[in-house]
């Protein structure tokens, strides 16, 4: 009678939207990688449903993923990076839906820190600083960087700038004065990987110096 | 209808070097892995090396870890295979392979003849 009752289930399940999409991230944690899926429809019931990632893999066939509340997580040295790979949602035994992906095509960066804006005086600049833990990396070194500030009265009103190192210069005459200012950044790879931004670094808030009214120059 | 095309195999003589390349007409050639496979006389088929799309990353067999270099240019659809150091147990027929797909190589080219005299 039970098997009667999961097949109905295994029925209803075939007619539910399962597309997923994933992220890898490259020694995430020292040598480890990992790779995370997630239900594009966050109204699918995943009670019963796997996700399973087969091929390009060292040492092993396949590797499931952990269940963390409602995404799919992999931590593990075992991605080869070189190939394609058969990633599937799964009941039991049975794929629903399958996607086969290149690791190294749908990678996301660790957000950028440890950002700071210094004003300096002698050059009417700000000097814009920020530290990334992809330096230090085997993999994904060559990132860009996107860096987006605003003033905090404008709600969408953002200024991007684009660049590959972790240093820029914004000169005082493009700011309002005696204004309050948001900046963060992001990054995605921009060599030999492809994929997706990063989460935005923490915001950082500045202040730019009022104008003197002598000179019409800000202070 | 050729689709790999292996050249730079031929005699020489235990010590030194020789550059294999492979010619890819398939035009995913930018977004697929390559490998390279070689067969000793009377033996199975042994792969090698292996390099990702971009070729950030490669991967070697223990037996030539340190005397073979894979690499590849993606403008000319070629793989190559940098052979230093060459011994005798070298020889063979030397196969590049495109796409790895799931642990299954989709495309073989017909091989080059490699010999090393002791």
């Known amino acids: 009678e039970s098997g009667y009752a999961q097949n109905g289930d295994l029925e209803d399940a075939e007619l539910d939207d399962y597309s997923f999409s994933c992220y890898s991230q490259l020694e995430v944690n020292g040598s480890q990688h990992s790779l995370t899926c997630a239900f594009e429809d966050p109204d699918v019931n995943t009670t019963n449903l796997e996700f399973e990632i087969c091929g390009a893999l060292v040492e092993v066939k396949c590797l499931n993923f952990r269940k963390l509340q409602e995404i799919y997580f992999i931590e593990t040295k075992k991605f080869l990076l070189i190939g394609k790979s058969n990633i599937c949602v799964k009941v039991g035994e049975k794929s629903l839906t399958c996607k086969k992906i290149d690791l190294t095509t749908i990678v996301k960066p660790e957000a950028p820190f440890d950002l700071s804006v210094i004003y300096r005086e002698g050059a009417n600049d700000f000097v814009v600083t920020f530290n990334t833990s992809h330096l230090q990396k085997k993999y994904v070194k060559v990132l860009m960087h996107d860096v987006a500030y605003r003033q905090e009265k404008d709600e969408n009103k953002w200024t991007h700038v684009n660049l590959s190192s972790t240093k820029l210069t914004l000169l005082q005459r493009k700011l309002q004065p005696a204004a309050m200012y948001e900046i963060k950044v992001r990054s995605i790879p921009d060599h030999y990987f492809k994929g997706f931004w990063s989460e935005w670094s923490p915001s950082y808030y500045f202040r730019t110096p009022e104008i003197n009214n002598s000179s019409g120059e800000m202070d | 209808e050729v689709q790999l095309v292996e050249s730079g195999g031929g005699l020489v003589q235990a010590g030194g070097s020789l550059r294999l390349s492979c010619e890819s007409s398939?035009?995913?050639?930018?977004?697929?892995?390559m490998g390279w496979f070689r067969q000793a006389p009377g033996k199975g088929l042994e792969w090698l090396a292996a390099?990702?799309?971009?070729?950030?990353?490669?991967h070697y067999s223990d037996s030539v870890k340190g005397r073979f270099t894979i690499s590849r240019d993606n403008a000319k659809n070629t793989v190559y295979l940098q052979m230093n150091s060459l011994k005798a147990e070298d020889t063979g027929r030397y196969y590049c392979a495109e796409d790895y797909d799931t642990d299954v190589w989709q495309y073989w080219g017909q091989g080059t003849q490699v010999t090393v005299s002791s």
């Open positions: 398939i035009s995913t050639f930018s977004s697929d892995a």
């Open positions: 390099i990702g799309w971009s070729g950030a990353v490669t």
